[in-house]
C-alpha cells in the first residue's frame, strides 16, 4: 500500500492559499503540470494547468487560480486567491506525461475555508474583508483530457484526525493504485 500524506490549511474567505509542489528537475521541468481537486467518490478534476511545454515562471491564471512553474527551482507554485467557502476540499498537483498516466506530486492539500473576516481576528462586523481584485487573465492553458483503463472507485476519506497544527500530517494508509490517476476535466 502507498502511504499518502496531506497538509491541512485553514483559511478565511478572501485569503490566499499559496503552496508549492516539488518535482524532479531533470525529469519534469518542461512537462505540463496541473492543479486538481479530488471530491469524494469522484475522479480528480483538473482546475488549471500550465502550458505545454510548461514555460519557466510564466504565470497561468484560470479564474482565481494562478500557476507558476519555476523550472530552475523544480517547483510548481499554486495560488488560489480570494478564497470562498466552496473552495474547501482536497487538492493535488500532477504532472502530465503522455502517453503514460499523470504523475501525482506529494503532498496533497486539504483546504478548509471558513466564513469570517481575513483581517484582524476578533474584528467586528464593520471590518473590511480583504478581497483582492484579480487582474484580467493573461494566459489560459488548455488542459488535456485523459482517459484510462484504471479506475479509482473512491477518493481518500476525509480525515477525522486533529490536524490543526502546521506540522501535522494526515497519513492515509491502505490506499492502493492511487498515485497514478486519470484526469478528467
Amino acid at each position: 500500500a502507498t502511504k499518502l500524506t496531506e497538509e491541512k490549511y485553514e483559511l478565511k474567505e478572501g485569503q490566499t492559499l499559496d503552496v508549492k509542489c516539488d518535482y524532479t528537475l531533470e525529469k519534469f521541468a518542461s512537462s505540463q503540470k496541473a492543479w486538481q481537486i479530488i471530491r469524494d467518490g469522484e475522479m480528480p478534476k483538473t482546475l488549471a494547468c500550465t502550458e505545454r511545454p510548461s514555460k519557466n515562471s510564466h504565470p497561468v491564471q484560470v479564474g482565481r487560480i494562478i500557476l507558476e512553474d519555476y523550472h530552475d527551482h523544480g517547483l510548481l507554485r499554486v495560488r488560489m486567491v480570494n478564497l470562498q467557502v466552496e473552495d474547501s476540499g482536497l487538492y493535488q498537483c500532477v504532472i502530465y506525461q503522455p502517453p503514460k498516466e499523470p504523475h501525482m506530486l506529494f503532498d496533497r492539500i486539504r483546504l478548509v475555508v471558513t466564513k469570517g473576516f481575513s483581517g484582524t481576528p476578533g474584528s467586528n462586523e464593520n471590518s473590511t474583508q480583504n478581497v483582492y481584485k484579480i487582474p484580467p487573465t493573461t494566459t489560459k492553458a488548455l488542459c488535456p483530457l485523459y482517459t484510462s483503463p484504471r479506475t479509482v472507485t473512491q477518493a481518500p476519506p476525509k480525515s477525522t484526525a486533529d490536524v490543526s497544527t502546521p506540522d501535522s500530517e494526515i497519513n492515509l494508509t491502505n490506499v492502493t493504485d492511487i498515485i497514478r490517476v486519470p484526469v478528467f476535466n
Partner: antibody
Framework: QVQLVQSGAEVKKPGASVKVSCKAS????????IHWVRQAPGQGLEWMGW????????NYAQKFQGWVTMTRDTSISTAYMELSRLTSDDTAVYYC??????????????WGQGTLVTVSS | SYELTQPPSVSVSPGQTASITCSGD??????VCWYQLKPGQSPILVIY???KRPSGIPERFSGSKSGNTAILTISGTQAMDEADYYC????????FGGGTKLTVL
C-alpha cells in the same frame, strides 16, 4: 522537537571563503526547505537563498548568485552555506531557518542560533 | 525586484496599541508573515498567513491586511515587546521588509 544547530563563530580575511553548517534534528530532514538569512550590523534581515534537501537543488537571491553555494549531507542531516570572496560587508550573523510546512516556502518557524562571521584584515 | 516597505520606527506607550505596516505590490495575493527580532537572539515568527499566531505567541499580537498593506498590531504593548519587526512574503524569491524598530516609551 525541531532543532537547528549552527557551527561556531568565524573570523576571516577579505577574499577568503567561509562555510557555515546547520545540523537539523527532530524531523525528517529531506522534507523541508532550509533557508539562509543574514543580518549585518545595524542592518535588516536579508534572505540569501533556499536549499531543497531532497533534491539538493538551491535557489539564490540575485545579489548572492555566483558567490554563495548551498549544499547538504543527508546522511548527517546537515545543510551548509559557503560564501566566497568575502569582504568587510559580509560581516554579519548568518542564520539557517526551516519552512513551517513541506508545501510552503514561508514562513520560517524554526531558526538556528546564528553564526557570527567577521571579515577583517 | 520585489520590495516590502515598512516604517523605520514606531513608538508606543506601555499599554497602548502599536501598529506596524508593510506594503508591497500585489501583497493582497501574497501571504504575509511577521518576525520579532531582539538583539543577540534569533528571529521569532509571530504571525503567519496574514493573521495566524503560532503557539506560544501572546494574543496581543494580531495581523490583518487591507488591499496591498499588511498590518501587525500589538495591543496592550509591554516593555518586553520592544524589538525590531520584519514582514516577509514570497514573490519569486523570499523577501523581507526593511524592518521597523518598535520603541516602548
Amino acid at each position: 522537537q525541531v532543532q537547528l544547530v549552527q557551527s561556531g563563530a568565524e573570523v576571516k580575511k577579505p577574499g577568503a571563503s567561509v562555510k557555515v553548517s546547520c545540523k537539523a534534528s527532530g524531523y525528517t530532514f529531506n522534507g523541508y526547505y532550509i533557508h539562509w538569512v543574514r543580518q549585518a550590523p545595524g542592518q535588516g534581515l536579508e534572505w540569501m537563498g533556499w536549499l531543497n534537501p531532497n533534491s539538493g537543488g538551491a535557489n539564490y537571491a540575485q545579489k548572492f548568485q555566483g558567490w554563495v553555494t548551498m549544499t547538504r549531507d543527508t546522511s548527517i542531516s546537515t545543510a551548509y552555506m559557503e560564501l566566497s570572496r568575502l569582504t568587510s560587508d559580509d560581516t554579519a550573523v548568518y542564520y539557517c531557518a526551516r519552512d513551517q510546512r513541506k508545501t510552503t516556502v514561508t514562513p520560517f518557524e524554526y531558526w538556528g542560533q546564528g553564526t557570527l562571521v567577521t571579515v577583517s584584515s | 525586484s520585489y520590495e516590502l516597505t515598512q516604517p523605520p520606527s514606531v513608538s508606543v506607550s506601555p499599554g497602548q496599541t502599536a501598529s506596524i505596516t508593510c506594503s508591497g505590490d500585489k501583497l493582497g495575493e501574497r501571504n504575509v508573515c511577521w518576525y520579532q527580532l531582539k538583539p543577540g537572539q534569533s528571529p521569532i515568527l509571530v504571525i503567519y498567513q496574514d493573521n495566524k499566531r503560532p503557539s506560544g505567541i501572546p494574543e496581543r499580537f494580531s495581523g490583518s491586511k487591507s488591499g496591498n498593506t499588511a498590518i501587525l498590531t500589538i495591543s496592550g504593548t509591554q516593555a518586553m515587546d520592544e524589538a525590531d519587526y520584519y514582514c516577509q512574503a514570497w514573490d519569486r524569491n523570499v523577501v523581507f521588509g526593511g524592518g521597523t524598530k518598535l520603541t516602548v516609551l
